[in-house]
Interface confidence: low
Amino acid sequence: SGEIALCKTGFPEDVYSAVLSKDVHEGQPLLNVKFSNCNGKRKVQYESSEPADFKVDEDGMVYAVRSFPLSSEHAKFLIYAQDKETQEKWQVAVKLSLKPTLTEESVKESAEVEEIVFPRQFSKHSGHLQRQKR
């Protein structure tokens, strides 16, 4: 008790990640990039490094500007935050990865079972696929 939490203005994370289905739809919310506004008085505006594909609202929610299939060319982009008064600027990377298909999920599930017996043989699967409950 009595501790003062140190607040650092900017993005608390270096990279924000989201796992998405392959078809991204226009207007689809993708993720929220939380900006630490320590004194609460800063007026921050956001900007995307890929404005044709992604936009950010005043609350830091990132949306798709248009419909497109998620691919490696869209997989990484930057979000900039700028203080409207001081022009001070911060940036953070956003990484989008593909939700595994059902086929990939079943491969992953069977691999997890097999790993108990053959950990080395199936280790190539581990950590790469994030399972999503439908």
Epitope: S21, K22, D23, H25, E26, G27, Q28, P29, M61, Y63, S67, F68, P69, T101, R134
Partner: antibody, heavy 115, light 106 residues
Framework: EVQLVESGAEVKKPGASVKVSCKAS????????MHWVRQAPGQGLEWMGY????????KYNEKFKGRVTMTRDTSTSTVYMELSSLRSEDTAVYYC????????WGQGTLVTVSS | EIVLTQSPSSLSASVGDRVTITCRAS?????MYWYQQKPGKAPKLLIY???NLAPGVPSRFSGSGSGTDFTLTISSLQPEDFATYYC?????????FGQGTKLEIK
């Protein structure tokens, strides 16, 4: 279990409006777009538009622009589709469809437009 | 808008037959979805992203294609497969459907 439950059948006069509801359960309502698709008797499927329940953004088929309005109520996980200035050609079954891959459909609501 | 043309419009086949339905887009699309519809019922998703089988759909159904030409194949027709099939594109609004292919028992 994911379910989309639509409101009951409607009979309307030409020129009137109809509002069909679609109540979602079994998943996070704001996670997916909700589409509306209609099917006239003996005809194929026709996409009318969608609503993004998260940010209340809509996209309509130009064919229905000015006549269709899609809304949502996040407190009840319900989306609504209102079609105005009804004509006999609007007689159809109206479906809501959503989910991760548009894989969940309502049971359909028959709207009959007749004088 | 992207126009999807399915062929054939109707098809008679027997149980055990291999059946292919094609869907041609008026301009290039990224992916195709396929649905099955039985009379008085809502459409049921069969294939998403061109070739991915929806949950619970038998493996006799498969999808393929790219660009403007896509196909739905049923490797060995079962009695419950007689229905109408629709393709749909989600690449560019309006998200149009094909006119449908009615698969009937021979």
């Amino acid at each position: 279990e994911v379910q989309l439950v639509e409101s009951g059948a409607e009979v309307k006069k030409p020129g009137a409006s109809v509002k069909v509801s679609c109540k979602a359960s079994g998943y996070t309502f704001t996670s997916y777009l909700m589409h509306w698709v209609r099917q006239a008797p003996g005809q194929g499927l026709e996409w009318m538009g969608y609503i993004n329940p998260y940010i209340d953004v809509t996209k309509y088929n130009e064919k229905f622009k000015g006549r269709v309005t899609m809304t949502r109520d996040t407190s009840t996980s319900t989306v609504y589709m209102e079609l105005s200035s009804l004509r006999s050609e609007d007689t159809a079954v109206y479906y809501c469809a959503g989910g991760d891959y548009e894989d969940y459909w309502g049971q359909g609501t028959l709207v009959t437009v007749s004088s | 808008e992207i126009v999807l043309t399915q062929s054939p419009s109707s098809l008679s086949a027997s149980v055990g037959d291999r059946v292919t339905i094609t869907c041609r887009a008026s301009s290039s699309v990224n992916y195709m979805y396929w649905y099955q519809q039985k009379p008085g019922k809502a459409p049921k998703l069969l294939i998403y992203y061109t070739s991915n089988l929806a949950p619970g759909v038998p493996s006799r159904f498969s999808g393929s294609g790219s660009g403007t030409d896509f196909t739905l194949t049923i490797s060995s027709l079962q009695p419950e497969d007689f229905a109408t099939y629709y393709c749909q594109q989600f690449s560019s609004p309006p998200f149009t459907f094909g006119q449908g292919t009615k698969l009937e028992i021979k």
